[in-house]
Each structure stands twice: as C-alpha cells, then as structure tokens.
C-alpha cells in the first residue's frame, strides 16, 4: 500500500485567525479557568495563632461536630489561600478556610487578580463549609481600582444589598448585578456550588457580537468575592455558644474563573510579555494588550472588534511607500462611503495629497515611473528668468512661460521672439522690418533722402547737441510693437541725464516713433540694445511716455559716456547751456 | 472664538459661474473639514460637498458633481465654493459649516 | 443616498409640555445622527451629535436617542422660545442628508 509520508504526523496547524485562502476571520484564545494557580488575597484565613473549629454533620435529626485544629505553621493542618485556585481532586479536597465566626457585619472577602482583561463566561466557588447566607461578587475593570457587583445571593436581598429580589432583566438593565435567593441553603452542609453565569438571563446575550454594553459586561480584570453573612442553625448564642461559633465560618475548596483572555477577536492566545505581563499575541494588524487598537501605520479604517462575519482587520494607510506615519480622519472616512479614512503624514520624495499620491508644488509626475517610485516626481526647474512661474503642469512638467517664451521649463524664446536683457520681458518680438515706401501715408516721402539724413551710427556727443535738446537719456529698448502710423518702443530708462518740464522717470516706459521715420531709419534702432536718446518734448499718442522723430539724436550707448554726460549735467545746472 | 465670515455676490445670473468664500478665525484650520450646505427658500437643507483643508481632498454630492469645486486657500484661512452653470432652481441660501461632531459652527450664509 | 424621514412634518404645542419628534433612516446609520434647531432668517443650530449627546450649552430640556434606523428627539418641557423648525441629519456615510424638518 502507499507509504505514510514521514511528515504526515507533522502538518503545519491551520492558522485560527485566517482561513484556507489567508483572509482574516475573527479568532479567540482557548476557554480556560482563569484562577488557575493564581494566588488569591483573602481578608482572613484560619490558623494564626493556631485555633479550633468543628465540622458539623448530620444524621438523620441528630448533629455531630468534629472539631479539628487550624495551624498556618503546620502544612498538614493549614487552610491556605493557595487550596482556592490548586488543582482540584474530590478525592482529596483542599480547602482554604477563614476564621470563626466572622458574622455580619463583618465580612471576608477573596480578591482575585487575573492579570489582564477577560472576558469572564462563569464565577464558581465549591464549598467545604455550608454556603454562605449572603455573598456578593464583584469585577474590576481597571486592575482593582474600582469595583462593580457582578451578583449578589441572599435571602433577604433588600436588607443586605438594597437590591429587590429577583428583579427581571430587560435590555435596558442588562448591564445591572441581580441578588437572587438561589444557592444561599445551608444544606448541603459541605460540597456546595454557588456557579454565577455572566450571561444567563441576559436578552442581547444570543447577539453578543453586536452588543457592546454585554461585552463590557463580561469584562473584568479582577474578581472579588465578599461573604457578608454566615448560615446558623441559631445556636451561636445559647449557653455553651463557644462550641457553636466554632462550627462557623466560610471554607471554599475551589475558586473557578471561566473565560477568556479578552482579545476583541484579533488573537488566538495570550502569552507572556517581557515584563511577564498577560497580553494578546495580536493578529490583523491590531495592537495593545487586549488587541484594542490599529498598529502604527495601520488606520485606514476605524478599529473594531472582530465578529463571526467580518475579521474587522486594521487595515494599512495607503501613502504609496512614501510616508511612515497616517492618521485616522473618521469624517473623511465616512466622507469616502466608509471605505477610507486614513491620512499620510509627512509625504517624502515630494510627494503630497493624502496619500501621497501627487507631485507637491513644483514637481511634476515621471510617467515612465509608477506613484510608488521615489522618484516618481520630478523637479520641474522652470526657467527663473522666462518661467511666470515654479508650478508646472503635473502631468506634463511644462512650466507657465512668459510672452514669447517656449520650451518645457521656457528656457528658449519662441520662434518670431529675440532675447532681451530684461527679466520682465526676456524675449521679445522681432521687429518687422518696416517698408522702404509706405503708398498709405501721402506725408510720407517718396525718397528718403529728401526726407532725412540717416544717421550713420557714428555720431559724436558734445556739449552742443546736449544743450539743443529738451532731454538725454540712456534706454535699453525691449519690445517692439506696430501700433497704427506709429512704432511703439517698450524701453527700460537706465539713466537721466536731463529732462525738461515734462518729468522722466527711471524704469520701464514706451518711446513713441513715427513709422515713417523709422522706414527711412531716422533715427536707427534695434531692439535688445542700449542708447544714448537726445530728443525735444512732444506729445506722445497715449500722453504718456517719451517721443523721438527724425531730429532726434539715437546714437548707440557707450559706457565711457556716463562720465562725460554727468559732466554735462552739472555745467547745465551752473547755468552753462545759455552760453552754448 | 470660532467664527465663518461668508463673502460672495448676491445675485449671479443664469448660466453664469457663483464664487462665495468662507473666511474662518478661532481655530487652526486645517484640522476640521468645511462643508457646504444650502437651503433654498422655505425648504430643508442639502448638504453639497466638503473640503479637508488638511491637504485639500474634497468630496461632493454626486448632484452637483461636474459642476461643484470646492478649494482651499490655506495662507488666508479660506475655503472658496465655486458652482458653474447656474440655474434659477439653484437659488437658495449657501452656508458653510464646520465639520466635526455635527455642524458646530455654521457660516451667516 | 441614506434617506432620512422625519415626522410629524409640524405640530402644536404649548409651553411646558413634553415634545418628541421621531427620525427613521432608510438603513442603519449606527448612532451617528444629530439634530439642528432653525429660526426664520438665522443658520441652523447644533442641539445633539451621535444621537444622544448635548452640545456644549445646549439646555437640558433638549435630549436624543436611538440608534440603528430608528432616532428621536425630545423637548422635555416646551418654552416659548423653542418654536422653530428641527433638523435631524445623519452623517453615517456620504452624501450626507437631512430630515425635511
């Protein structure tokens, strides 16, 4: 027959938190007795100093008592609180025990740490001792700091707990402790169970999944349990009551906690920390010790505990691998139809929205590199001079460009533009070159010659020429433009080195020209270049700004001539141009 | 205190675009999502869209979308609704208001 | 859309009695509904959030419950000053909607 694989025995053991196709699905850790072996702290037991106590029995109508000795020295003879949570044998029963006769008003109490939250299915105490007449227990929630009862017993509920008999629970107070008469017969003598059920009788207990204020009931971290009042047969106080009292006090041979490592469904166990703390071995990207939060970087979606339909799994921010840290947002969640709620925080390699899943300003998309590539944004590097902008197009990186100006990061000037030297305008529209004769203007002349001189270019600077004219500037022409019978001039006035009555003014400004002037070059100019202008007041056509005509002296700038015209306009202001 | 000051025109005609502001002081303003909500005379409240001025993500009701922006200026603490092809059943009181728990805080609309 | 219908559409009452409006959503929206007071010419006011928390200097006489689909809203003892049209709104997923007050 086949051979059995040597392996076969050894079979990985299915994950209890996700199923066959690695989806999640809501695990829990084992059921155990939470009391196990745990150390228990009782207001009294028995034994120190050594004392006596009696066991009563019956037979038929008669009682007996055997009286036997309590020493805490004596492991033979002790009552420990360590019997409460030992292993429990029958046939070889351990019983812690407290002292005699601690009656009402006194009471004893067993205080249980269970180390962290569980959620707890059943409290039992098996009893040595007749049950008690009255007994209380309580829970925790905060490691002991502040108590809750959980369930009282007692045949007579309203003098010993304020509390009605057997009140019904509805849903309205199902997260209320009830005192029932149950379990409180002083018989049996010895051997009893009080078994409190978390759950029984409560209405949203077949729906527990979705019933928050039930999971918050069954939640405890530590367990109390209170004996408020002893079982008599009423003897205590007759003539030989020495005997009597002896015979009571509370004896529990097992303390059960019945429950679960609390792990809101996202663990299947609970193991040791390295400060030896119980926490959950989380799962489903959850963390914290009862696996009652998302793990860093993992809130897309609100935290919730798992239930039987849904894993409820912590699920990652999507930041496109550029980002360590999210948070959860809960309106944008629910803004998103409740699919997505969490934000990147901190997009790296320029990045940003999000989820990191654009350029930031003045970076633009690589296509040729998916969104969660580092450098899936490239810098746009628009041009500082041509660009009208550090933003560009993020799909296409093509940056704003000035007039006239092209190229991906309008780093060129654009076909009909020249270059200038203006950071304001950096190219500039070539200047048509203007028609010999004009047959639209009947003032404009035939022949040129007639019309003007020329100017050659050459022409010298003296103190003469400067004092004939109503002003000398130095400009940088910039742009050209045909406007009607006239050329108008965008130039940067650089210096002024006289002026008239009307004022001139540094910076940017238009120099007017008539086009036929400019036809016969009268005067000669070119843009992108510096001149010296000497010309007379004249209205210009937009009333603003500078006029020069075929009278006017533009000679092409040279730096040597700054000094000399400085010297011009100080000899002006001594009153020098008169006599010229 | 928080305070939304609402700025815009009045009055915009038929197939022309509305711009109404909403100025906010009293709180840092990127950690609360703003909202649009109108209210056309005599009727109920609709809720338009809203803003995460957080990093400028948006969501809109599907009514008014193609036809509904809602932007952020951060630098001047604004959120701007810009609605495109306006029709005379648009007219209604526009508000703004603050996301959170509940609108807390509403615009004068 | 999640619709919310509130009912009654109006009703009388008289200073000091007990006043209750009900909000029944088309699907569950869990407990997050609120409530809104209006007064002709003002913006609407927040009265309750996750549909039983006062707001913040909202008098006691105003209270909320309800979860799921089923919501309502309660003026314990009616003042004078509490006519107005009433608002519940649910912010459970978007697009966000309100009652027809």
């Known amino acids: 027959g086949p051979g059995l694989s040597m392996f076969a025995g050894q079979a990985a053991q299915p994950d209890p938190c996700s199923d066959e196709n690695g989806h999640p699905r809501r695990c829990i850790p084992d059921f155990v007795n939470a009391a196990f072996g745990k150390d228990v702290r009782v207001s009294s037991t028995c034994g120190r100093p050594p004392a006596r106590y009696c066991v009563v029995s019956e037979r038929g109508e008669e009682r007996l008592r055997s009286c036997h000795l309590c020493n805490a020295s004596d492991p033979k003879k002790a009552h420990p609180p360590a019997f409460l949570t030992d292993l429990n044998n029958p046939h070889n029963l351990t019983c812690w025990q407290s002292e005699n006769y601690l009656q009402f008003p006194h009471n004893v109490t067993l205080t249980l740490s269970l180390g962290k939250k569980f959620e707890v299915t059943y409290v039992s105490l098996q009893f040595c001792s007749p049950r008690p007449e009255s007994m209380a227990i309580y829970k925790s929630m905060d490691y002991g700091r502040t108590w809750v009862p959980f369930q009282f017993y007692s045949t007579q509920c309203r003098k010993m707990y304020n509390r009605p008999h057997r009140a019904p629970i509805t849903k309205q107070n199902e997260q209320e402790a009830v005192c029932t008469d149950s379990h409180t017969d002083m018989r049996p003598l010895s051997g009893g169970l009080i078994a409190f059920s978390t759950l029984d009788g409560r209405p949203s207990a077949h729906d527990f999944d979705n019933s928050p204020v039930l999971q918050d009931w069954v939640t405890a971290t530590d367990i109390r349990v209170a004996f408020s009042r002893l079982h008599t047969f009423g003897d205590e106080n007759e003539d030989d009551s020495e005997l009597a009292r002896d015979s009571y006090f509370y004896a529990v041979s097992d303390l059960q906690v019945g429950g679960r490592c609390k792990c809101n469904g996202h663990a299947a166990r609970c193991v040791r920390d390295r400060d030896d703390s119980l926490v959950c071995d989380c799962r489903h990207n959850t963390a914290g010790p009862e696996c009652d939060r998302c793990k860093p970087f993992h809130y897309d979606r609100p935290w919730q505990r798992a239930t039987a339909r849904e894993a409820n799994e912590c699920v990652a921010c999507n930041c496109n691998l550029h980002a360590r840290r999210c948070r959860f947002n809960m309106e944008l969640y629910k803004l998103s139809g409740r699919k997505s709620g969490g934000v990147c925080l901190n997009c790296r390699h320029n990045t940003a929205g999000r989820h990191c899943h654009y350029c930031k300003e003045g970076y633009y998309r690589d296509m040729g590199k998916p969104i969660t590539h580092r450098k899936a944004c490239k810098a746009c590097d628009c041009h500082p001079v041509g660009a009208a902008g550090k933003t560009c197009n993020q799909t296409t990186g093509q940056c704003p460009c000035k007039d006239g100006v092209t190229g991906i990061t309008c780093n060129r000037c654009a076909k009909g533009y020249q270059q200038s030297r203006s950071p304001i305008a950096p190219c500039i529209k070539i200047p048509v070159a203007p028609p010999t004769t004009a047959a639209s203007s009947v003032e404009e002349p035939e022949d040129c010659d007639s019309y003007c001189k020329a100017s050659k270019g050459k022409l010298k600077i003296n103190m003469k020429k400067y004092c004939k004219k109503d002003y000398a500037v130095q400009i940088h022409i910039l742009k050209a433009d045909k406007a009607g019978d006239w050329w108008k001039f965008t130039v940067n006035i650089i210096s002024v080195y006289k002026q008239g009555t009307s004022r001139i003014r540094r910076g940017d400004q238009s120099l007017w020209i008539r086009s036929r002037d400019i036809a016969c070059k009268c005067p000669k100019i070119k843009p992108l270049k510096k001149y010296l202008l000497l010309g007379n007041a004249e209205d210009s056509p937009d009333q603003s700004g500078i006029v020069a005509d075929k009278s006017s002296l533009v000679i092409q700038w040279r730096d040597t001539w700054a000094r000399r015209l400085r010297k011009f306009q100080q000899r002006e202001k001594k009153g020098k141009c008169k006599k010229a | 205190q928080v305070q939304l000051q609402q700025s815009g025109p009045g009055l915009v005609k038929p197939s022309q675009t509305l711009s109404l502001t909403c100025a906010i002081s009293?709180?840092?303003?990127?950690?609360?999502?703003m909202h649009w909500v109108r209210q056309a005379t005599g009727q109920g409240l609709e809720w338009m869209g809203a803003?995460?001025?957080?990093?400028?993500?948006?969501s809109y009701n599907q009514k008014f979308k193609g036809r509904l922006t809602i932007s952020k200026d951060t630098s001047k603490n604004q959120v701007v609704l810009t609605m495109t092809n306006m029709d005379p059943v648009d007219t209604a009181t526009y508000y703004c208001?603050?996301?959170?728990?509940?609108?807390?805080?509403w615009g004068q609309g | 859309d999640i619709q919310m219908t509130q009912s009654p559409s109006s009703l009388s009452a008289s200073v000091g009695d007990r006043v209750t409006i009900t909000c029944k959503a088309s699907?569950?929206?869990?407990?997050?509904v609120a409530w809104y007071l209006q007064k002709p010419g003002q913006s609407p006011q927040l009265l309750i959030y996750?549909?039983?928390n006062r707001y913040t200097g909202v008098p006691s006489r105003f209270s909320g419950s309800g979860s799921g689909t089923d919501f309502t809203f309660t003026i314990s003892s009616l003042e004078a000053e509490d006519a107005a049209t009433y608002y519940c709104?649910?912010?459970?997923?978007?697009?966000?909607?309100f009652g027809q007050g």
């Open positions: 208001a603050r996301g959170g728990t509940g609108f807390a805080y």
């Open positions: 009293g709180y840092t303003f990127t950690s609360y999502n």
């Open positions: 803003i995460y001025p957080g990093n400028g993500d948006t």
């Open positions: 699907q569950s929206v869990s407990n997050d």
């Open positions: 996750y549909a039983s």
């Open positions: 709104q649910q912010d459970y997923s978007s697009p966000w909607t």
